[in-house]
Structure formats: C-alpha cells, structure tokens
C-alpha cells in the first residue's frame, strides 16, 4: 500500500511534470514567429486512454519528437532549452510510471498538434494531482 510519503513524492513529481508542460505551452503561446506555423504542422500521437500513471508510457514515447519540434523554436525569446527540458521530463516520467511492468501504449487514431498534445498531458497531470490532493 502506498505510504503518505510515497504519495507526497508522487504528487511533487506530478507537479513538476505539470509545470514543465505548462512552461512549454506558455513558450509556444508566446511565440510570435513564422516557425510557429511550422511547429504546428508536426503531428503527435495521443493516448487512447490516459487515466493512470502507467499511461505515461505514451508520453515517454513522444518525448523525442517533442524535443525535435522544440529545437525549431530556439531563439532569444524562447527560454526553454529542449535537451535539458526533455531530459528532465524523461527522468520524472520514468520515476512516475515505474519500470517494473511493461505497458504497451495504445494510441488514438487521430494525431494532434503540439498544442493539443501538451494540453492533453497537462489535463492528465491535473486530474491525477486532484485525486491526490
């Protein structure tokens, strides 16, 4: 059974993941550049279901494409360093989903833009944090 300290740690990690995703989305929303149009042409796979921590496998599998798209945005007004950022997110995701069980991610038929993708995973974090609070 999860202890209060393990729940607290999970909540803290989810809050970190949530903030990182919100930071990316804010950077993109603030981005006034022709590159933004190009960024929005990239398609991301969305999870068919995302209600449990194990479903973070679906996010993990999309982190490399996410880093590649964010690399397009590099400028003096885009303050997120994609390599550091994605590395940080990856560490959090691995800790949250655990590595004991292998979960095969199922993706939805429809792909999504980077904004839709980020919003989906932000909502995921928020809903799980809400159940822990």
């Amino acid at each position: 059974a999860p202890t209060s300290s393990s729940t607290k740690k999970t909540q803290l990690q989810l809050e970190h993941l949530l903030l990182d995703l919100q930071m990316i989305l804010n950077g993109i929303n603030n981005y006034k550049n022709p590159k933004l149009t190009r960024m929005l042409t990239f398609k991301f796979y969305m999870p068919k279901k995302a209600t449990e921590l194990k479903h973070l496998q679906c996010l993990e599998e999309e982190l490399k494409p996410l880093e590649e798209v964010l690399n397009l945005a590099q400028s003096k007004n885009f303050h997120l360093r994609p390599r550091d950022l994605i590395s940080n997110i990856n560490v959090i995701v691995l800790e949250l989903k655990g590595s004991e069980t292998t979960f095969m991610c199922e993706y939805a038929d429809e792909t999504a833009t980077i904004v839709e993708f980020l919003n989906r995973w932000i909502t995921f974090c928020q809903s799980i944090i809400s159940t822990l609070t």
Partner: antibody, heavy 113, light 107 residues
C-alpha cells in the same frame, strides 16, 4: 523553517537594469519551482514568470518577455530576477514565491529620473 | 490568458459578520484556484488552495468552495485581524493570473 529572503530596496534610473535575489532555506531548493510576482503601488498582483530550480529553464509572461531574465544558483539556493530597460511603470514591490505558498518579504524597486 | 474577476472590489463589515467574496474565471479552471490574504506592506499569505483546501495554520473560519468558473471565499465570523485585501489566483494554465482584489474594511 521554510524561508525566502530577498535583497534590499533599489532605486534605479529609467533605462537601467535591476537584479533582485531570493535566497531559499528550510527546504530542498530543487523541490519547488520559483515564481516571481510584482505589485505596483496600490495595485494588484502580477505574475512575471517561473524558473525550474533544478534545470534552470524558465518561462515568462508575454508582457515581460525580452526584458526579464530569471536565473538560479543551486550552490547557494538562490534565485535571481533581472529586469532591464526599466521605466517608471516598473516601480513595484517584487516578490519571489516558492510553489506559490511561501513568499519572500518583497523588494521595492523604484524607477525615477 | 484566463481573466479572474472578483466581486465586490471592496466591502465594509463588522467583527463577527459572515463575509463572502466571489471570484469568476473567464473559462473553466476546474479547482485550480487559490485565495490569498494581504495586509499593507506585507507579502500575500496563502489561505486556500485547490479551491477548498485550507492551508496549514489558517483558521477554520476561512473556507473556499466552487469549481469550473465560479468560486467563493467565506469568512464565517470576521475577526479584527481579517481586515485586509483578498486575492483569488488561477494556476490552471500559464500565465498565472490573479483577481483584482477585494478590500475588506471595518464598518
């Protein structure tokens, strides 16, 4: 106990820059992201941005983008907020806040010629 | 950006009164809302987080309710130390935004 201690009041001329520090103690510095919020005299609260204390990357409110820089020094558990090209409207109390629940005492920055 | 609108902007009340302050978000923010109290010359103090959770050390006369777009802060029995300005704040999405504040004054 958990505490954020900010640097002292500053008086600056228009066009100058100001750098405010915020030293954290009483908790694991990298556990909570640091926000900066400002409050002009007699006005409400305005969010400026956030920094991830572990990795150092930042995200700013659009209004401040290009003028604000947030940095951190993990060795001293200190976060910095630098605002450049100051104008009279930047006269305000600047707060750092860890996780939005613990706040620094505030730093008054006055911009006047 | 999500706009947060508080009402009233100020109110006069007496010690012992029940005081209610409302906050409306321009779009649904679920329960990602906090309430702060600020006294002159001091930093804001967190009272309520997650719309209805009482921050540790905050008196139980303070309570929060609501979800979606409409939220309420209630002080069940106003005490002398409660005269201050109160702000709501959403953290549902960046940029984080605050209400314009409600000043609670002595009648």
């Amino acid at each position: 106990q958990v505490q954020l201690v900010q640097s002292g009041a500053e008086v600056k001329k228009p066009g100058a820059s100001v750098k405010v520090s915020c030293k954290a103690s009483g908790y694991t510095f990298t556990d909570y992201y640091m926000h900066w919020v400002r409050q002009a005299p007699g006005q409400g609260l305005e969010w400026m941005g956030i920094i991830n204390p572990r990795a150092g990357y930042t995200s700013y409110a659009l209004k401040f983008q290009g003028r604000v820089t947030m940095t951190r020094d993990t060795s001293t558990s200190t976060v910095y907020m630098e605002l450049s090209s100051l104008r009279s409207e930047d006269t305000a109390v600047y707060y750092c806040t860890s996780g939005m629940d613990v706040w620094g005492q505030g730093t008054l920055v006055t911009v006047s010629s | 950006d999500i706009q947060m609108t508080q009402s009233p902007s100020s109110l006069s009340a007496s010690v012992g009164d029940r005081v209610t302050i409302t906050c409306r978000a321009s779009q649904s923010i679920s329960t990602w809302l906090a309430w702060y109290q600020q006294k002159p010359g001091k930093a804001p103090k967190l009272l309520i987080y997650a719309a209805s959770s009482l921050q540790s050390g905050v008196p139980s006369r303070f309570s929060g309710s609501g979800s979606g777009t409409d939220f309420t802060l209630t002080i069940s029995s106003l005490q002398p130390e409660d005269f201050a300005t109160y702000y709501c704040q959403q953290s549902y999405s960046f940029p984080v935004t605050f209400g314009q504040g409600t000043k609670v004054e002595i009648k």
